[in-house]
């Protein structure tokens, strides 16, 4: 978790002098509770926005927006703490809006926004806005939270972001798999425009089960420049196991930008349809 660019972050608006500060996520009002505290944020909204860094890279960012309730506690509002928690790592990053002037009611509802938390593809975050000072131990909570799931690199808008492109999102291998005679699979896919090797991972399963009955790895050497964007055809030999008929083919590239952590693409071949007709019963039963 990080902030985009660390350029001057602004929270001031007409009628309010405000500064954005780094926060330890442990506001002083936790330790020294105040008697009078503001009410909670209203109508917390989160959107995925896309922002360029000063270097020109494009990153997904969480755009956080909320409004104030129109009650008298606005007079005791000293700022807000914005917290983003990445759920699978428990990593948390906070910033603090510090109000340098008193808020006054005006003709329209106060609205605040912040769009500088960089988020990762396919990650879920808990986004919390806490009004400051925080409430006394038994006081009503004055925060609002939402869990926000960022789309993965398959998403059309995410595909062109720097983190997705770095992991190979622009490569579309257009995998085709066909079953040949004599227990063979023919795998065909489009090579990317980089002289790097690929790996085909074959995993076979019984018809209705999820534990594998056959696994095979096939290495494809780095193509020459004249082979870029061409189709690569590979024939894989299967183990002759009755019922081991559902095949998952996964292609792992090793692009220089992502090495052994690139996006993988896969295709699945289902088992052939079983005939509905029952086995014929023999006319006689052998006695031995």
């Amino acid at each position: 978790l990080r902030l985009l660019d660390h350029r001057a972050l602004v929270c001031s608006q007409p009628g309010l002098n405000c500064t954005v500060k780094n926060s330890t996520c442990l506001d002083d009002s936790w330790i020294h509770p105040r008697n009078l505290t503001p009410s909670s944020p209203k109508d917390l909204q989160i959107q995925l926005h896309f922002a360029h860094t000063q270097q020109g890279d494009l990153f997904p960012v969480a755009h956080i927006e909320w409004t104030l309730q129109t009650d008298a506690s606005i007079l005791y509002l000293e700022g807000a703490e914005l917290s983003v928690l990445q759920l699978n790592t428990n990593e948390r990053l906070c910033v603090r809006f510090e109000f340098l002037s008193k808020l006054r009611h005006h003709h329209r509802r106060w609205r605040f926004t912040f769009s500088h938390f960089v988020v990762d593809p396919d990650q879920e975050y808990e986004v919390t806005v806490h009004h400051l000072p925080k409430p006394i131990p038994d006081g009503d909570p004055n925060h609002q939270s939402k869990n926000f799931l960022v789309p993965d690199c398959e998403h059309a808008r995410m595909k062109v972001t720097t983190p997705c492109m770095s992991s190979g999102s622009l490569w579309d291998p257009n995998i085709t798999v066909e079953t040949l005679e004599a227990h063979q699979l023919r795998v065909s896919f489009t090579l990317w425009n980089e002289s790097t090797h690929y790996q085909i991972l074959l995993t076979s399963f019984p018809h209705m089960e999820n534990h594998s009955c056959f696994e095979h790895m096939h290495h494809i050497p780095a193509p020459r420049p004249e082979e870029f964007h061409q189709r690569s055809n590979v024939t894989l030999t299967l183990r002759n196991l009755k019922g081991c008929c559902r095949h998952q083919v996964q292609i792992q590239p090793f692009f220089s930008s992502c090495l052994n952590d690139c996006l993988r693409h896969s295709a699945t071949v289902s088992c052939p349809e079983m005939p509905d007709t029952p086995e014929p019963i023999p006319d006689y039963m052998p006695l031995w």
């Epitope: 959107q47 995925l48 869990n147 398959e154």
Partner: nanobody, 126 residues
Framework: EVQLVESGGGLVQPGRSLRLSCVAS????????MHWVRQAPGKGLEWVSG????????DYADSVKGRFTISRDNAKNSLYLQMNSLRAEDTALYYC???????????????????RGQGTLVTVSS
């Protein structure tokens, strides 16, 4: 112009099933989370269910959990709601709604619904 057109509502007996459909046009359907919301007679709008852009995540209001199933077909720009074991309290006008935000928030919209359809009426009565 964004359009959401719901269908599939009707009069049904308690315990029976219905399947609602919604066809979307005028925006990149596959980029957005979609939701079903409903409005019972004389009541406010109630969120029913949501589904992420790629169907990877689905959420339901407690009142419909285990009975309703949301799904989508991005190739057909369509959203569905399979409603089983219907009860009288499910009687409402059902709307298909588009999330304003890209991304997905569990338990409702991330950022309001910027569009919803005209609705399809579901009446559960014996």
């Amino acid at each position: 112009e964004v359009q959401l057109v719901e269908s599939g509502g009707g009069l049904v007996q308690p315990g029976r099933s219905l399947r609602l459909s919604c066809v979307a046009s005028g925006f990149a359907f596959a980029d957005y989370a979609m939701h079903w919301v409903r409005q019972a007679p004389g009541k406010g709008l109630e969120w029913v269910s949501g589904i992420s852009w790629n169907s990877g995540r689905r959420d339901y209001a407690d009142s419909v959990k285990g009975r309703f199933t949301i799904s989508r077909d991005n190739a057909k720009n369509s959203l569905y709601l399979q409603m089983n074991s219907l009860r009288a309290e499910d009687t409402a006008l059902y709307y298909c709604a588009k999330d304003r935000a890209i991304g997905y928030c569990s338990g409702g919209s991330c950022s309001d619904f910027d569009y919803r359809g005209q609705g399809t009426l579901v009446t559960v009565s014996s």
